[in-house]
């Protein structure tokens, strides 16, 4: 008799793929543009990335450090009107892209939450949640919550408002903290909160360290849904050298939870390569004309246009991973088992019932390594086969689709492999 199928978990839209943050409309659009109408014209690009949600803004009126002149219900006219916003919402909906609005109040000021009048600000947020939910927004983000006194209780209240409207609505909180205990205390009182933090931001050193961070986090958070990013707002290049970007893309897309990226992560956008550009929001490189300040500073392979035409580019890798993440059951909601693969390596399996299974092997080191996959670490339900097909490598030169013997697996420096193998009873 065939074994019974495992019951599928309830999946919310943010469980099904990546979120894409556009914190600075002007930097994202470039060329002196930077409004909601212009963003609407970029939705096809977001569709091509297969992202499930757009985390937008903040775009509300905020006079720096002035509570009275901060209005979370009014769109800053520099970004457009309510009509523009509504039009963006409708267009995004047609393309199955959800819109999450950042309501971090004092985004132009020193302290994101103002240093005084906490209750006044919290009431403004409550009003804004209700207003924008009724206007059709799919969720909200609030950042820098380490600056918000009694953050846990406010987040619980805002979560109740968000979920009270519809279980299909999302609240994301962001913190600069990388401390697991602080992160857990924020999560404790907020069941469905998605939290972005700097927890993984110092993980770039070794595979063992990354494995330790990831497994500690997953063990500590139990069954709850996680999000994966390196910070609450900044680009991957703020934390990682260029040679690790592909590795991290592969990891973020294949860990159990929602991957969260900032605009430009998909092309390796790096403020340091663009003199005069702010670290937190450099101009998006659509093509070589996007950064006219210094002629020749931008080459084609740094841009969306150039990378779109190159199947071996970071952007092409991002699109492939995003596509896999959104359609494979084992990556959507599969179980996760990390196991030993040797020093410098981080490896894990994703599997769901009788669906195709995935093996991820990541070499964080700058030397080539042979992987000694310790299958004995794995439960019987997640055993390794002798061979697995190579779905993709982060490095060029491997023949995709070819079966690889897992006992003889060798990885290049900074290489990540995504392998697939069938369920075997």
């Amino acid at each position: 008799r065939a074994p019974r199928c495992r019951e599928l978990p309830a999946q919310k839209w943010w469980h099904t793929g990546a979120l894409y943050r556009i914190g600075d409309l002007q930097a994202f659009q470039g060329h002196g543009a930077g409004n909601l109408a212009g963003l609407k014209g970029r939705l096809d690009y977001l569709s091509s990335l297969k992202v499930k949600g757009l985390v937008l803004g903040p775009i509300h009126k905020n006079q720096k450090d002035d509570v009275a002149q901060t209005d979370l219900l009014q769109i800053d006219p520099n970004f457009g009107s309510k009509e523009d916003f509504d039009s963006l919402l409708q267009s995004a909906k047609k393309k199955s892209i959800r819109v999450i609005l950042d309501l971090t109040p004092n985004y132009r000021g020193e302290n994101s939450w103002f240093s005084t009048q906490v209750d006044t600000v919290a009431t403004k947020v409550k009003d804004a949640l209700e207003f924008w939910l009724q206007a059709g927004v799919d969720g909200f983000q609030v950042r820098d919550i380490e600056n918000l006194k009694d953050a846990s209780s406010f987040l619980a209240e805002w979560q109740n408002i968000t979920k009270g409207f519809s279980e299909d609505r999302l609240l994301i909180a962001g913190t600069n903290s990388s401390d697991l205990q602080q992160i857990l205390s924020l999560l404790e009182s907020n069941k469905d909160l998605l939290l972005t933090s700097s927890y993984l931001s110092d993980s770039g050193s070794t595979g063992e360290h990354t494995k330790s961070l990831v497994t500690q986090y997953l063990n500590a958070t139990g069954n709850r849904w996680c999000s994966w990013s390196l910070s609450q707002a900044r680009l991957l290049t703020s934390f990682l050298p260029a040679q690790l970007l592909r590795l991290y893309q592969l990891m973020l897309f294949t860990l159990p939870g929602t991957p969260v990226f900032s605009y430009g992560d998909e092309i390796g956008l790096d403020a340091a390569a663009l003199p005069g550009q702010p670290m937190e929001a450099p101009v998006m490189l659509w093509d070589e004309s996007s950064f006219p300040d210094i002629p020749g500073a931008v080459s084609a392979n740094m841009t969306v246009k150039g990378q779109s035409e190159d199947p071996g580019s970071l952007l092409s890798l991002f699109r492939r991973l995003s596509d896999q993440r959104s359609k494979e059951r084992s990556l959507l909601h599969g179980d996760f088992h990390a196991f030993s693969a040797g020093p410098g390596l981080f490896s894990y399996i994703r599997h769901w019932d009788q669906n195709e299974r995935f093996l991820v092997v990541l070499n964080f080191g700058d030397v080539g390594l042979s992987a000694g996959l310790q299958a004995s670490d794995l439960p019987a339900s997640a055993s390794l086969p002798a061979k697995a097909d190579l779905l993709l490598s982060t490095q060029p030169g491997r023949e995709e689709g070819s079966p690889l013997e897992l006992e003889r697996l060798k990885l290049e420096p900074h290489e990540g492999l995504l392998l697939r193998f069938p369920y075997a009873a």
Epitope: A68, D71, L73, D86, K124, D127, E130, L133, Q134, G136
Partner: antibody, heavy 119, light 114 residues
Framework: QVQLQESGPGLVKPSETLSLTCTVS????????VHWIRQPPGKGLEWLGL???????NYNSALMSRVTISKDTSKNQVSLKLSSVTAADTAVYYC?????????????WGQGTLVTVSS | DIVMTQSPDSLAVSLGERATINCKSS????????????LTWYQQKPGQPPKLLIY???TRESGVPDRFSGSGSGTDFTLTISSLQAEDVAVYYC??????????FGQGTKVEIK
């Protein structure tokens, strides 16, 4: 119990500014929003604006350049100012509480105050 | 702005009989986010302020007699008084309660006793 009471001059000259106050009791202005609505004699209702618990304001765009809503939470008062009035602004003016989460419905209303614009 | 149109303008119904008031909006008032319909009904008796009867198209406000019911979705709505009482003589208004301001009212329907 919840109460709202409008007050202000019953007669205003054309081109002047109409000023009304809504005094509330039985609830806090830091927890509920307050709408202003008007009704010309023998006619229907027209929504003017809403001031939220946190102080944000939505206005009827048809009157936006002339209407100002504010509040003094410590006095439990919401005020409405309408500038450059004409005879067409003659109406009973009501304040009403925004009573439900995820709805702009008005669950409690003041008795209304008649304002006549005439020289 | 959303335009609300009520019909009929006035209605005469015998005591104990059913009264039906219609309201049409110029665009759908269904919020796909929570599947609620953002339409509100008020009753205004002579010399009094309006009174909230129904919100979300069919949710009766507490204290409102169950002879009042609201129905409809999208753009077409109905307020029904199942058995008209003398105290129900009033003008009834529908209001768009949807999304962005202004939250406009219908022109009103006057209900009298035949």
């Amino acid at each position: 119990q919840v109460q709202l009471q409008e007050s202000g001059p019953g007669l205003v000259k054309p081109s002047e500014t109409l000023s009304l106050t809504c005094t509330v009791s039985g609830f806090s202005l830091t927890s509920y929003g307050v709408h202003w609505i008007r009704q010309p004699p023998g006619k229907g209702l027209e929504w003017l604006g809403l001031i939220w618990a946190g102080g944000s304001i939505n206005y009827n765009s048809a009157l936006m350049s002339r209407v100002t809503i504010s509040k003094d939470t410590s006095k439990n008062q919401v005020s409405l100012k309408l500038s450059s009035v004409t005879a067409a602004d003659t109406a009973v003016y009501y304040c009403a509480r925004k009573g439900h989460m995820y709805s702009y419905a008005m669950d409690y209303w003041g008795q209304g105050t008649l304002v006549t614009v005439s020289s | 702005d959303i335009v609300m149109t009520q019909s009929p303008d006035s209605l005469a119904v015998s005591l104990g009989e059913r009264a039906t008031i219609n309201c049409k909006s110029s665009q759908s008032l269904l919020n796909s986010g929570n599947q609620k319909t953002y339409l509100t009904w008020y009753q205004q008796k002579p010399g009094q302020p309006p009174k909230l009867l129904i919100y979300w198209a069919s949710t009766r406000e507490s204290g409102v007699p169950d002879r009042f019911s609201g129905s409809g979705s999208g753009t077409d709505f109905t307020l029904t008084i199942s058995s008209l009482q003398a105290e129900d003589v009033a003008v009834y208004y529908c209001q768009n309660d949807y999304s962005y301001p202004p939250w406009t009212f219908g022109q009103g329907t006057k209900v009298e006793i035949k």
